[in-house]
Interface confidence: medium
Amino acid sequence: EVEKTACPSGKKAPEIDESLIFYKKWELEACVDAALLATQMDRVNAIPFTYEQLDVLKHKLDELYPQGYPESVIQHLGYLFLKMSPEDIRKWNVTSLETLKALLEVNKGHEMSPQVATLIDRFVKGRGQLDKDTLDTLTAFYPGYLCSLSPEELSSVPPSSIWAVRPQDLDTCDPRQLDVLYPKARLAFQNMNGSEYFVKIQSFLGGAPTEDLKALSQQNVSMDLATFMKLRTDAVLPLTVAEVQKLLGPHVEGLKAEERHRPVRDWILRQRQDDLDTLGLGLQG
C-alpha cells in the first residue's frame, strides 16, 4: 500500500507525459489524478515507466474502479496488462474483439499466461459461444488454443466457427476433442463438392465414424497415410480391404511401412489373408 502524501507544489500532473518517468512512486500516487490516468491510458505505453511505477498506476486504477475496469480503460492497458492478476481480470466485462486483440498482442510470443487464459475465458463466456471471429483471433495468437479446451467447452463452438480452424490448430487435439469437432465440421462443409470437402474435412477425420469413412472411399479422395494413422481404430476396423484401397488410392502402398502400428496393425488382423493378398503388399494377417 502506497502511503498517502500531499503532492509537492508545482508537481500536479496536468497530463500523462514523459515528465512522469522522473516522479518517485509516492509522487505518482500523490500527483497523478486517477481519472486523468484512466482517460489517457493510451499514453502510458509510450513512457518508460519502471515496473515499480506501473504498480502505482495499477493501484490508482484499482482504487478508481474497485468493481473492475471499464472496457475503455482495458483496451489501452498495453503492458500494464502484464501486471494484472487473474482475480483482477475476472472483474472485467470485455466484449470488443479489438480489446481482446490489443491485450493478446501484449503477450505475443509468450506461452499462454494465467492472465490471458482468464481473459479469454471471460471474453468467450461473455459472448456465449466461440464465434468465428473470436476463434480466428485466438488461433492466430495461440495455434494450440482449440485443443486446450475440454470436449464440454468445444460443444459450444458453432459449426460456422469451424471455417476459422486451420489444420495446425488441431495438431494437439486428442480423439475425444475430435469426436466433438468432427460433426460440426461435417455440418459446416456439407455444401462443398467432393474434392474441396475432403481438403477441409481432412484434419477433423480423427473424429469420423465408420460410415463416413466408407462414404469417403467412394469419392476418390486419396487420403494420405498421416491422416489414415490418426483415424479412430474402432472406425477403421470394419472397413473392407477394397474400401481401404479406394480410400487411400495411390497411398495404399504406405500400409506396409505402418503394418505394426495402430490402426493399421489391428485392421490387418481383422482381414482375410486372401483379401490382403490382393493389395500385393505382403501384408500378413
Epitope: 514523459e18 518517468i21 512512486k25 509510450a46 513512457i47 518508460p48 519502471t50 515496473y51 515499480e52 504498480d55 503492458y79 502484464l82 501484449v106 505475443k108 510470443g109 509468450h110
Partner: antibody
Framework: QVQLQQSGAELVRPGTSVKVSCKAS????????IEWVKQRPGQGLEWIGV????????KYNEKFKGKATLTADKSSSTAYMQLSSLTSEDSAVYFC???????????WGQGTLVTVSA | DIVMTQSHKFMSTSVGDRVSITCKAS??????VAWYQRKPGQSPKLLIY???TRHTGVPDRFTGSGSGTDYTLTISYMQAEDLALYYC?????????FGGGTKLEIK
C-alpha cells in the same frame, strides 16, 4: 532474430567525450526499451539508464546523471550513449540491452570497450 | 538503492549435479528478479525473469524461485556448457541493481 550491434572499441583522452552506438535489428525498434550497463574490469554490472526509442523518454541512475546522455534515432534503429568529461573511472565495457517483449534485458549487444588514457 | 547479494562468489560442481545459486535483496522486490548467464568473452544472457519465468529458448533444467527478499536459480542437471558466471538482478525499481555474480567451477 533480435540483434544489437555495438560500435567498436574506443581509446580516448581524459576530459573528452565519446559516443557509443547500438544498432538494433530483428524487431520493431520503437516498441521496446534500450538499457545501458557498465562493467569495469574485475567489477560487477552497473545500470546506467534506459531510453524508450519510441518517445525519447529516458531514466538515469542518479550516479550517471551528467555523465551519460541517452538518445535514439528511429530512422536508423540506433540508440546512442554519450559519455562526457571522461576520467580513468570511465574506462569500462559498456553494454546496451533490449527489454524485448517486456522481458528485462532480454538481448544484449556484444559490448564496447572504452579506454580513457592520456 | 536495493542491494542484491550473492553470498557465494564461487561454487564447485560436477556434471549431473543439482546446483542452487542464491541471491538476497536488501528489501522486498516483489518477485521482480532476473538471472543472467555470462560465459568468458560473451555478453550476459537472460535466463529467468519475474523470479520464475524462463526466457525464450532457455533449457528447462534452469528454474527460478523465490519471493520477498530471497531468490534461487536452480540447475537441475548440471552440464559442461553451464559452467559460467551467473548474476541476479532486481528489475523492480530504478536503479536496477545486479548481484556480484556466482561462478560455477568444476570440482
Amino acid at each position: 532474430q533480435v540483434q544489437l550491434q555495438q560500435s567498436g572499441a574506443e581509446l580516448v583522452r581524459p576530459g573528452t567525450s565519446v559516443k557509443v552506438s547500438c544498432k538494433a535489428s530483428g524487431y520493431a525498434f520503437t516498441n521496446y526499451l534500450i538499457e545501458w550497463v557498465k562493467q569495469r574490469p574485475g567489477q560487477g554490472l552497473e545500470w546506467i539508464g534506459v531510453i524508450n526509442p519510441g518517445s525519447g523518454g529516458t531514466k538515469y541512475n542518479e550516479k550517471f546523471k551528467g555523465k551519460a546522455t541517452l538518445t535514439a534515432d528511429k530512422s536508423s534503429s540506433t540508440a546512442y550513449m554519450q559519455l562526457s568529461s571522461l576520467t580513468s573511472e570511465d574506462s569500462a565495457v559498456y553494454f546496451c540491452a533490449s527489454d524485448y517483449d517486456y522481458d528485462p534485458f532480454a538481448y544484449w549487444g556484444q559490448g564496447t570497450l572504452v579506454t580513457v588514457s592520456a | 538503492d536495493i542491494v542484491m547479494t550473492q553470498s557465494h562468489k564461487f561454487m564447485s560442481t560436477s556434471v549431473g549435479d543439482r546446483v542452487s545459486i542464491t541471491c538476497k535483496a536488501s528489501q522486498d522486490v516483489s518477485t521482480a528478479v532476473a538471472w543472467y548467464q555470462r560465459k568468458p568473452g560473451q555478453s550476459p544472457k537472460l535466463l529467468i525473469y519475474w523470479a520464475s519465468t524462463r526466457h525464450t529458448g532457455v533449457p528447462d533444467r534452469f528454474t527460478g524461485s523465490g519471493s520477498g527478499t530471497d531468490y534461487t536459480l536452480t540447475i537441475s542437471y548440471m552440464q559442461a556448457e553451464d559452467l559460467a558466471l551467473y548474476y541476479c538482478q532486481q528489475h523492480y525499481s530504478t536503479p536496477y541493481t545486479f548481484g556480484g555474480g556466482t561462478k560455477l567451477e568444476i570440482k
